[in-house]
């Protein structure tokens, strides 16, 4: 399964789309900036089996997909870019699912890294809570967009390390 190569390209396309989605100057949103506590340590470990690593990446993409699939998101972002972004994420999710099955065998259940997946879930809960507290304001969404761009960039480094390990 050559997921890291294909996923890296998909990640790059997703990053480009995220960059294009910006609709408000971040310089007007400095008062709203926030530290969401990206779970860096979950993307630092070399202890992962490939299937486990993919399951953590899958969770991050899934949570991002969920976040940008809400009606509040639809009301914020330019529709055609949002659709392209969602399609890109969906393709990545499908690729990952196929890859995990290939890695562990159809009959086996992949050993999920429960703690890492929980850390990613909590990270996105913090993002959702922030948006709620800020009443889904344009600046709040801009801050979240910047955060997701950074988390994608950091996961890209993780994927590249995964590829080197192979």
């Amino acid at each position: 399964c050559d997921l890291p190569q294909t996923h890296s390209l998909g990640n790059r396309r997703a990053l480009i789309l995220l960059a294009q989605m910006g609709r408000i100057s971040p310089f007007s949103c400095l008062k709203d900036r926030h530290d969401f506590g990206f779970p860096q340590e979950e993307f630092d470990g070399n202890q992962f089996q490939k299937a486990q690593a993919i399951s953590v990446l899958h969770e991050m993409i899934q949570q991002t997909f969920n976040l940008f699939s809400t009606k509040d998101s639809s009301a914020t972002w330019e529709q055609s870019l949002l659709e392209k972004f969602s399609t890109e994420l969906n393709q990545q999710l499908n690729d990952m699912e196929a890859c995990v099955i290939q890695e562990v065998g159809v009959e086996e259940t992949p050993l999920m890294n429960v703690d890492s997946i929980l850390a990613v879930k909590k990270y996105f809960q913090r993002i959702t809570l922030y948006l709620t507290e800020k009443k889904y304001s344009p600046c709040a969404w801009e801050v979240v967009r910047a955060e997701i761009m950074r988390s994608f960039s950091l996961s890209k480094i993780f994927q590249e390390r995964l590829r080197r390990k192979e």
Partner: antibody
Framework: EVQLQQSGGDLVKPGGSLKLSCAAS????????MSWVRQTPDKRLDWVSI????????YYPDSVKGRFTISRDNAKNTLYLQMSSLKSEDTAMYYC????????????????WGQGTSVTVSS | DIVMTQAAFSNPVTLGTSASISCRSS???????????LYWYLQKPGQSPQLLIY???NLASGVPDRFSSSGSGIDFTLRISRVEAEDVGAYYC?????????FGSGTKLEIK
């Protein structure tokens, strides 16, 4: 290895124009915000302008607003500073700098700097 | 604009001993998100500035742990635990809390 190679500095008369360039390599240029910072003859650092990674948004302090324009060409991995209506107080060493990826906390730390290019405004 | 104030020179220090450089801002740099947007840069003679510290107390990549920084939100101190000859240069504090971003005038580290 991250590199920012600068060019375009020169001696120019008051009221004149100049365009500075900063060629980036060793990183995904289109993913990073960039700034220009100048160092005056008395060695003070003076932040001049900033541009977002995609180039859609810019900001300038009042001292250069309306006279300086920051831009970028992500296809060419190059940052620019167009300076017009130059004054003697614009005389400085101009540095381009890359901003660290800040995410939602918008950390605009300048983690890499070019070697600088000298601009002298004098009649 | 936020004004960053620094002394022009540090107290002269002996190699191997500790040094402190101070900086004061005209407004608290502590954001409601808990981050203090204070930065330290070092410019060695004949070189471009380099990032030392970000968000008041975090060491930038490749910076030796002899460097540390602390502060209250308005008053900040950069400490060098064992000064080496290569630490000579001008130290600038800067703020990224508000636009326009501003720098201190720089403090030159003096060696005895």
């Amino acid at each position: 290895e991250v590199q920012l190679q600068q060019s375009g500095g020169d001696l120019v008369k008051p009221g004149g124009s100049l365009k500075l360039s900063c060629a980036a390599s060793g990183f995904t240029f289109s993913s990073y915000g960039m700034s220009w910072v100048r160092q005056t003859p008395d060695k003070r650092l003076d932040w001049v302008s900033i541009i977002t990674s995609g180039g859609s948004y810019t900001y300038y302090p009042d001292s250069v607003k309306g006279r300086f324009t920051i831009s970028r060409d992500n296809a060419k991995n190059t940052l620019y500073l167009q300076m017009s209506s130059l004054k003697s107080e614009d005389t400085a060493m101009y540095y381009c700098a890359r901003h660290a990826e800040g995410g939602g906390n918008y950390d605009y730390a300048m983690d890499y700097w070019g070697q600088g290019t000298s601009v002298t405004v004098s009649s | 604009d936020i004004v960053m104030t620094q002394a022009a020179f540090s107290n002269p220090v002996t190699l191997g001993t500790s040094a402190s450089i101070s900086c004061r801002s005209s407004k608290s740099l502590l954001h409601s998100n808990g981050i203090t947007y204070l930065y330290w840069y070092l410019q060695k003679p004949g070189q471009s500035p380099q990032l030392l510290i970000y968000q008041m107390s975090n060491l930038a990549s490749g910076v030796p742990d002899r460097f540390s920084s602390s502060g209250s939100g308005i008053d900040f101190t950069l400490r060098i635990s064992r000064v080496e000859a290569e630490d000579v240069g001008a130290y600038y504090c800067a703020q990224n809390l508000e636009l326009p971003f501003t720098f201190g005038s720089g403090t030159k580290l003096e060696i005895k």
